[in-house]
Interface confidence: medium
């Protein structure tokens, strides 16, 4: 068999609620994927699980099943959302993230995706994982790759 | 049409405390922040401070934190000042105007007179 | 605070004159300047903001230069309404901050 190629391609959109109460954060990350098929055969891909983590925290987990086929030669992109909570011992971030005497309250995510896939009774899974910036201050739709974290200092503006 | 439309003029005696309002109009009042801005007779402008609607965040300018308190009624669409304490230097036209996260003003509202005389 | 100072605070032009108003901060605020006309009985209107951005529905006689320090509000070709009062404004930092302002009057 050819190999199932998985690229994370970023973020799409974040969708941020608080609960001031309780100095929570909710963030709904929409992430998306493009999946490869470079046999010459349909392969299903079965199912889709996420995790979201910050500062070395699990933040929020998603699991998607029975996703779709994908046929020979071809390649689908698929969205997924992840529900993430940042709270308790984090609770200190809703005054960062709703602070408004800055303009853009950029966090750094860590998104870990794998992607299992199947074909004549074989399965496979596929793990990527990457740094995301996400703004937690506002809603935001990001173009594809926008959010990336790189880990250089860039210059200033 | 975005519009912000305030309450009426006022005349308060020193040492009182008045809350001014500002009905937002013609778009989705948790979008966008709201800024309030003082402009004394024959002056300039003065920013006192923003009020997210979506999460009732606030930022004062410290020349103004203890003059005023920014509020907001989601459902009624209302921002509102509270001034206490006044004296004549409060005495002026009082602007609500609303701003995205890049900190200018898109729309103003039609301001609000606010006279402090015994 | 960023310091504004607007020059000058009175200017008088004829229509079809072009005329430039400056603004120049204590300290460099990138391109975020933004400029606002006041006009009575009628709401403060945003002209540009970031320096040089047109906001929509404002006529292309509007154009606003400069980054840093320096800025400049140029009207071009002045219409009869266009005599008002402008303002400029920071949006770089907290606390906001204006320019005193200029009186655009018709000579």
């Known amino acids: 068999p050819r190999s199932i190629e998985v690229k994370y391609i970023g973020v799409k959109s974040a969708y941020v609620s608080y609960d001031a109460e309780k100095r929570t954060i909710y963030l709904n990350i929409t992430n998306t994927l493009n999946i490869t098929n470079n046999n010459y055969y349909s392969v299903e891909v079965e199912n889709i699980t996420a995790q979201v983590q910050f500062s070395k925290t699990v933040i929020g987990k998603a699991r998607l099943n029975n996703i779709t086929n994908i046929g020979p030669l071809d390649m689908k992109q698929i969205d997924y959302t992840v529900p993430t909570v940042i709270a308790e011992e984090m609770s200190y971030m809703y005054d960062f993230c709703t602070l408004l005497s800055i303009k853009v309250h950029n966090i750094v995510l860590m998104m870990q995706v794998t992607v299992t896939t199947a074909y004549f009774g074989h399965s496979e899974q596929i793990s990527q994982e990457r740094y995301q910036y996400v703004d937690c201050g506002r809603n935001t739709t990001y173009q594809l790759a926008q959010s990336e974290y790189l880990n250089v200092l860039q210059p200033q503006q | 049409e975005v519009q912000l439309q305030q309450s009426g003029p006022v005349l308060v005696k020193p040492g009182a405390s008045v809350k001014l309002s500002c009905k937002a109009s013609g778009y989705t009042f948790t979008d966008y922040y709201m800024n309030w801005v003082k402009q004394s007779h024959g002056k300039s402008l003065e920013w006192i401070g923003v009020?997210?609607?979506?999460?009732?965040?606030?930022s004062y300018n410290q020349k103004f934190q203890d003059k005023a308190t920014l509020t907001v009624d989601k459902s009624s669409s209302t921002a509102y000042m509270g001034l206490n304490s006044l004296t004549s230097e409060d005495s002026a036209v009082y602007y609500c105007?609303?701003?995205?996260?890049?900190?200018?003003?898109?729309?103003w509202g039609t301001g609000t007179t606010v006279t402090v005389s015994s | 605070d960023v310091q504004i100072t607007q020059s000058p605070s009175y200017l008088a032009a004829s229509p079809g004159e072009t005329i430039t108003i400056n603004c120049r901060a204590s300290r460099s605020i990138s391109k975020y300047l933004a400029w606002y006309q006041e006009k009575p009985g009628k709401t403060n209107k945003l002209l540009i903001y970031?320096?040089?951005t047109l906001q929509s529905g404002i006529p292309s006689r509007f154009s606003g230069s400069g980054s840093g320090t320096d800025f400049t509000l140029t009207i071009s070709s002045l219409e009869p309404e266009d005599f008002a009062v402008y303002y400029c404004q920071q949006h770089n930092e907290y606390p906001l901050t204006f320019g005193a302002g200029t009186k655009l009057e018709l000579k």
């Open positions: 105007a609303n701003g995205n996260y890049d900190w200018y003003f898109d729309v």
């Open positions: 009020i997210n609607p979506y999460n009732g965040a606030t």
């Open positions: 970031s320096g040089s």
